[in-house]
Interface confidence: low
Amino acid sequence: KKVVLGKKGDTVELTCTASQKKSIQFHWKNSNQIKILGNQGSFLTKGPSKLNDRADSRRSLWDQGNFPLIIKNLKIEDSDTYICEVEDQKEEVQLLVFGLTANSDTHLLQGQSLTLTLESPPGSSPSVQCRSPRGKNIQGGKTLSVSQLELQDSGTWTCTVLQNQKKVEFKIDIVVLAFQKASSIVYKKEGEQVEFSFPLAFTVEKLTGSGELWWQAERASSSKSWITFDLKNKEVSVKRVTQDPKLQMGKKLPLHLTLPQALPQYAGSGNLTLALEAKTGKLHQEVNLVVMRATQLQKNLTCEVWGPTSPKLMLSLKLENKEAKVSKREKAVWVLNPEAGMWQCLLSDSGQVLLESNIKVLPTWSTPVQP
């Protein structure tokens, strides 16, 4: 018996061929011997089966001795043995219809689980293998689960259902809702304007929700909410903002925040959360601000940084075009009685300069100038 696999919602064509290459009498019946369709001369006739409005044939092929049964908008319950009667012969075809669906929604938050459920006809024992967009293969039976979805899981999942050495493939588009970056760090000199950007890693027609930026300043004992906002159809509107600092927020995506001045008291870490309408859970992005200040007080030239620096970052003070006078894995360095000239304070990681501040030291009788 020939086995044909079909996909729920698709169209399948079951073939039936006579030895004579001409139009002759044929009938298609199901396993209960109920007629589905057949011919009366050149006319298509239909029986009382449940397939009535979804069954068809190709009259253009009858003259060649081909009498296909076409079933549209397949349903799991269409799985059956179909019998073609032609020339006193019976051709049997077993049709097995499968469906594969994602649990609830195909738009899932980063970290959530994806469950794919296979609908299959009674008596079948299919195996399923799905390949994620990042090349991961997941195997299972009636259900497949992937926990802790990551950004790279966004895209087309290709699932192969195997039954009786036959295969049918499904394609499911999954969108993982996340920020493009889990974390970012901004390095600024004291007094500079700070731009924080929170680009999303997905695009949807309408995006509605609400968000908040909580900030833990290095110098503060507790965190505080710097800004809350609403998002409606990709339009941003600020609900509440602190007076110090007074953040500004862009009205369009990507989410964009401006801090007018980088000051030591603002250095620290923030957590932007975004709750999307009709989704449980929130999107998160961490943002860090490191602020540098170079000062000269009497005979002491000091360079300081505030904020979340890693222990391997190096802070250096050097006179322009000369070797560093002092380099330490510390958050403050200083030089006593500095020579006159342009001094540079450098924050670097493995030789790469992340932040630089210049301060001009004048001969001892004059006042320092900060360019």
Epitope: R134, G135, T158
Partner: antibody, heavy 118, light 111 residues
Framework: QVQLQQSGAELAKPGASVKMSCKAS????????MHWVKQRPGQGLEWIGY????????VYLQKFKDKATLTADKSSSTTYMQLSSLTSEDSAVYYC???????????WGQGTLVTVSA | DIVLTPSPASLAVSLGQRATISCRAS??????????MHWYQQKPGQPPKLLIY???NLESGIPARFSGSGSRTDFTLTIDPVEADDVATYYC?????????FGGGTKLEIK
């Protein structure tokens, strides 16, 4: 940049076992499958199997099911392959290869030469 | 398992001419709009190098002289024009389903 650093050459006696390593760097180790490929001298490439480092899930070519064992250590971003009950047929260069996106091994280790000799 | 059969096993081409290598799969390696067939170049003593991924996509850093085409069961790697540096063995590989498989390889020489 992505790098796969394999352990050095192995000389083993018939019946013994060897365990070779492949240390990954330059990417998120748990996000991609790691494959192993065999090449006997003057012969073609033969796929052995892969491991998903995030779960430890493995798939082997049937003929290597009782021969090769793949493991992964997430803390050191290293994949291991152990070959058991060695025979002269196991003398070959073994490569690890990272699968990227939806197909193709864009990154390969330099290979580990295994010589089985009495 | 999907069996990949390359042809020819070896070929000699004059410099500046076109080389065509074929690979036939025992069953379709297509999955909707993707063909999971890849091509590699290997020189003696070196690991293979990915040239073409998913039938027709040129890997970054590979010269545009290399191109790939085909779908379902029949695939072709074309090198045009051939240069002296192209002397190597070329392999096709499918990753449509487990177990992944390689073709036997085609050795390219210069006439």
């Amino acid at each position: 940049q992505v790098q796969l650093q394999q352990s050095g050459a192995e000389l083993a006696k018939p019946g013994a076992s060897v365990k070779m390593s492949c240390k990954a760097s330059g990417y998120t180790f748990t996000n991609y499958l790691m494959h192993w490929v065999k090449q006997r001298p003057g012969q073609g490439l033969e796929w052995i199997g892969y491991i998903d480092p995030s779960t430890g899930y493995t798939v082997y070519l049937q003929k290597f099911k009782d021969k090769a064992t793949l493991t992964a250590d997430k803390s050191s971003s290293t994949t291991y392959m152990q070959l058991s009950s060695l025979t002269s047929e196991d003398s070959a260069v073994y490569y690890c290869a990272k699968e990227g996106g939806i197909g193709g091994f864009a990154y390969w280790g330099q290979g580990t030469l295994v010589t089985v000799s009495a | 398992d999907i069996v990949l059969t390359p042809s020819p096993a070896s070929l000699a081409v004059s410099l500046g001419q076109r080389a065509t290598i074929s690979c036939r799969a025992s069953e379709s390696v297509d999955s909707y709009d993707n063909s999971f067939m890849h091509w590699y170049q290997q020189k003696p003593g070196q690991p293979p190098k990915l040239l073409i991924y998913r039938a027709s996509n040129l890997e970054s850093g590979i010269p545009a002289r290399f191109s790939g085409s085909g779908s379902r069961t029949d695939f072709t790697l074309t090198i045009d024009p051939v240069e002296a540096d192209d002397v190597a063995t070329y392999y096709c590989q499918q990753s449509k389903e487990d177990p992944y498989t390689f073709g036997g390889g085609t050795k390219l020489e210069i006439k």
